[in-house]
Interface confidence: low
């Protein structure tokens, strides 16, 4: 299963199968992930050794039991892959590091005002992978506001040093963030020149451009198909790269196909794993396991729950079958590659489905780094848990924020309901940042059932807490995946960067916002609160924040969004914005449902028919 | 600040086409929508469609669909509105408009079309 | 398309006085109203806007009520700077749409 515990002051020992330099546990941890063999990590801040050779070392470890022996290293933080975690498995990385040079080949420096322009240069750049820019404060002045754009062989720097007034971070191109564009032709009897940066073993081309897409220098790619004239080379898929970005040639050859990575697409990138299953295909590797199965797709789940399986076989031969069930060959290699691939036989085969976002399991996400006052606008992917509910009578506007917390349920403010609650009006938009983009062509969740908290009652600030139950589920992308739930009974005070975020007002008697805003706000307590708000009962279930000089606050429009506090480099959903004596007003917090307070509740309504929790909050 | 710089006054005969620019600074370009909004002489005022220059979709007023295109350069924050098929009632001050939300707050100073045989 | 009527087309008012220009629509626009002033050969100036928000550089003399299909604004006392033609304009649906416009003039 999915585990996301972080061991602080601990390192596991031995299993090592790759190590690099990485900025934080977070980055090291992605890496893992993605690694075919990596279920265990360990990393090395800065702070935690002297040895300048292993500072910010992130090492990569495997297991047959899945599991090491964990030794006691004051600052060292280990943890699993996170692999079979669904969405939240991500390669986008948004963080800032500052203090921290990322060393590299440096093939592109020019002077730009700000560490998030650096950013953008290196995403809109395709060959650079990560970035340093020098501010303003630098000690040698010509090299002040320089932007160096980076790369290297594996896609991590090469060496990372402590300086001073210097920010690194990393293209965000595995966010889909990039403004290159990217081609999705795949362009069949054509091989494409240039340096090969890897060669594996894949059925189609469909499998090379996905491994292409995730590999760190791979911008195109040329597959050799099963009929291709010399034997050694079918299926061979070359990943390349050049100088200029793109093939300097390309070749007619019949029965190869050529295409580019997908890694420049904007909005939406493939998912780094592959779930096609090809009947009448051998799929040859590592031994990891043999089990009887009845069917190809149970095969396949079961590769997927084994978390070291890469691929399997499905046997049809009368000797692997007995009764309704055949053998399932679980596999593995080095590079998460079949070792060999033959045509023509009776098994059917494919590759686990660890990688996959669309997992169903907890909904944490750690990944990310009424208009708001005070706020900024916000960017695409930065809270994908955010939706628009908004209403179509005559014409159509945002009511309401909400907050997804699984495939098919939205945790939303009941108040946002008082006077509508047909549902068939409602119209639920979802990885969206500007309410500009919604056409009529944009598409939209209807609402299956709207569930009220029973204690609920129109005009009163109490139990303001609704569970939007969704038509239809939807899919996980870097634009749209849920909030992790607090566990029951939590503490806000361990909160200390909480961020509210919708399209309400930008002030009192404001309008509706275009572009999604944020703003940072700190958790008051409730003793404070009620001085505040001495006409009124602040409950226990109830979290405010605010600022004492006002300022910044949620307004009318983003009720029922989310407040959320990152805490251990995860986002949790702790409170729905609910009301509020004005927007901002000094000494006048904004009061929010606290949602711990109602976790059995939301699990209690979501469970599914089989008795199944649609989502659960974490361990 | 936020600015918004039309390109000069046209004349044009009927049946041609003419095409306006707007170059925008002050605010991130591709963040808010561009609207075009026409005022005939001692007439109204007209509201033709709009540009997100982030994504290139467009929103026009059917009244004008088939003869109005809104396009974006982002490398230089300009928009440009080409109306084709131009007829005499086409004449008219052109004006680009940047909501706030959802009414203009800013706008160009206007470019005069005069279609005159 | 949501039709606005603006009403009077035009009036003559001396400084001082109380001014009331209303704007009614074809069908219910839920507040998504805004006002403009608009002076010979110049652009519209956005005056005011949804539930009364009142646009930076305007004097709180202009103020803006109503709800529904009827809308309406006033200008508490007329100064010489406020002759101008002023417009409605709907933005609760697209095609947005404009009043025909009041010109206020001096009497």
């Known amino acids: 299963g999915c585990l996301t515990q972080l061991y602080e002051n601990a390192f596991f020992r031995g299993g090592d199968v790759a190590s690099m330099y990485t900025p934080n546990a977070q980055y090291c941890q992605m890496r893992c992930t993605f690694h075919p063999r990596c279920l265990l990590f360990s990393f090395l801040p800065a702070s935690s050794i002297n040895d300048m050779e292993k500072r910010f070392g992130c090492f990569l470890k495997d297991s047959v039991t899945g599991t090491l022996p964990k030794v006691h290293r004051t600052g060292a933080v280990s943890g699993h892959s996170l692999k079979q975690c669904g969405h939240q498995i991500s390669a986008c990385h948004r963080d800032i590091y500052k203090g921290v040079d990322m060393r590299g080949v440096n093939f592109n420096v020019s002077k730009v005002s700000s560490v998030e322009e650096c950013q953008k240069r290196c995403t809109s750049n395709i060959r650079c992978q990560f970035f340093s820019y020098a501010t303003q404060t630098f000690h040698k002045a010509e090299y002040r506001n320089n932007c160096l754009l980076k790369y290297s062989p594996g896609g991590t720097p090469t060496a990372i040093k402590v300086l001073s007034n210097v920010e690194s971070g990393f293209s965000l191109k595995p966010c889909a963030l990039s403004e290159i564009g990217c081609h999705m032709n795949i362009f069949q009897h054509l091989a494409f020149s240039d340096v090969d940066v890897a060669r594996v073993l894949t059925p189609d081309a469909f499998v090379c451009r996905t491994i292409c897409t995730y590999h760190p220098n791979c911008l195109f790619f040329t597959f050799y198909t099963n009929v291709w004239k010399i034997e050694s080379q079918r299926n061979v898929c070359l990943l390349k790269t050049s100088e200029s970005g793109t093939p300097s040639s390309s070749t007619p050859q019949e029965n190869t196909i050529s295409g580019y990575s997908l890694l420049t697409c904007k909005r939406t990138l493939p998912e780094p794993c592959h779930s096609k299953i090809y009947p009448g295909v051998d799929f040859g590797g590592e031994e990891l396991n043999v089990t009887f199965v009845k069917g190809v797709n149970v095969c396949q789940e079961t590769c997927t729950k084994m978390i070291r399986c890469q691929f399997f076989t499905y046997s049809l031969l009368p000797e692997d079958c007995k009764e309704e069930k055949c053998k399932c060959f679980l596999r593995l290699s080095m590079d998460g590659s079949p070792t060999r691939i033959a045509y023509g036989t009776q098994g059917s085969s494919g590759y686990s489905l660890r990688l996959c976002n669309t997992g169903d399991n907890s909904v944490c996400t750690t990944k990310t780094s009424t208009r708001i006052v005070g706020g900024t606008n916000s960017s695409w992917g930065e809270w994908p848990w955010q939706v628009s509910l908004q209403v179509k009578l005559t014409a159509q506007r945002h009511l309401c924020g909400g907050s997804l917390i699984g495939h098919q349920w939205v945790l939303t403010a009941a108040h946002c309901f008082d006077g509508l609650p047909l549902q068939d009006v409602w119209r639920i938009y979802s990885g969206i940042l500007n309410l500009s983009d919604i056409t009529k062509d944009t598409p939209f969740s209807q609402i299956k059932e709207i569930i009220i908290h029973q204690n609920y009652k129109v005009s009163e600030g109490n139990h303001d807490i609704a569970l939007i139950k969704l038509q239809a589920p939807l899919n996980y992308t870097e634009f749209q995946k849920p909030i992790c739930l607090p566990s029951k009974g939590d503490t806000s005070t361990i909160y200390t960067n909480c961020w509210v975020t919708g399209w309400g007002f930008s002030k009192e008697k404001g309008e509706i916002q275009n572009i999604l805003q944020k703003v940072n706000i700190p958790l008051v307590t409730n003793e404070e609160c009620q001085k505040r708000y001495q006409d009124y009962k602040i409950t226990q279930r109830m979290v405010c924040a605010g600022y004492k000089e006002g300022g910044k606050d949620a307004c009318k429009g983003d009720s029922g969004g989310p407040l959320v506090c990152k805490h251990n480099g995860m986002w949790r959903l702790v409170g729905i914005t609910s009301w509020g004596e004005g927007c901002a007003r000094r000494e006048q917090p904004g009061v929010y449902t606290k949602v711990a307070e109602y976790m059995d509740w939301i699990l209690e309504k979501t469970q599914s028919s089989d008795g199944k929790a649609q989502m659960q909050s974490p361990a | 600040q936020v600015q918004l710089v039309q390109s000069g006054a046209e004349v044009k005969k009927p049946g041609a086409s003419v095409k306006v620019s707007c170059k925008a600074s002050g605010y991130t370009f591709t963040d808010y929508e561009m609207h075009w909004v026409r005022q005939a002489p001692g007439q109204g005022l007209e509201w033709m469609g709009a540009i997100h220059p982030g994504s290139g979709g467009t929103a026009y007023n059917q009244k004008f669909k088939g003869r109005v295109t809104m396009t974006r350069d982002t490398s230089t924050s300009t928009v440009y509105m080409e109306l084709s098929s131009l007829r005499s009632e086409d004449t008219a001050v052109y004006y680009c408009?940047?909501?706030?939300?959802?009414?203009?707050?800013?706008w160009g100073q206007g470019t005069l079309v005069t279609v005159s045989s | 398309d949501i039709q606005m009527t603006q009403s009077p087309s035009s009036l003559s008012a001396s400084v001082g006085e109380r001014v009331t220009i209303t704007c009614k629509a074809s069908e219910d626009i839920y507040n998504r109203l805004a006002w403009y002033q608009q002076k010979p050969g110049k652009a519209p100036k956005l005056l005011l806007y949804g539930e009364t928000g009142l646009e930076a550089g305007f004097h709180l003399r202009f103020s803006g009520s109503g709800s529904g299909t009827h809308y309406t604004l006033t200008i508490a006392s007329l100064q010489p700077e406020d002759f101008a033609t002023y417009y409605c304009q709907q933005y609760w649906s697209t095609p947005w749409t404009f009043g025909q416009g009041t010109k206020v003039e001096i009497k």
């Open positions: 408009a940047r909501p706030y939300g959802y009414p203009f707050a800013y």
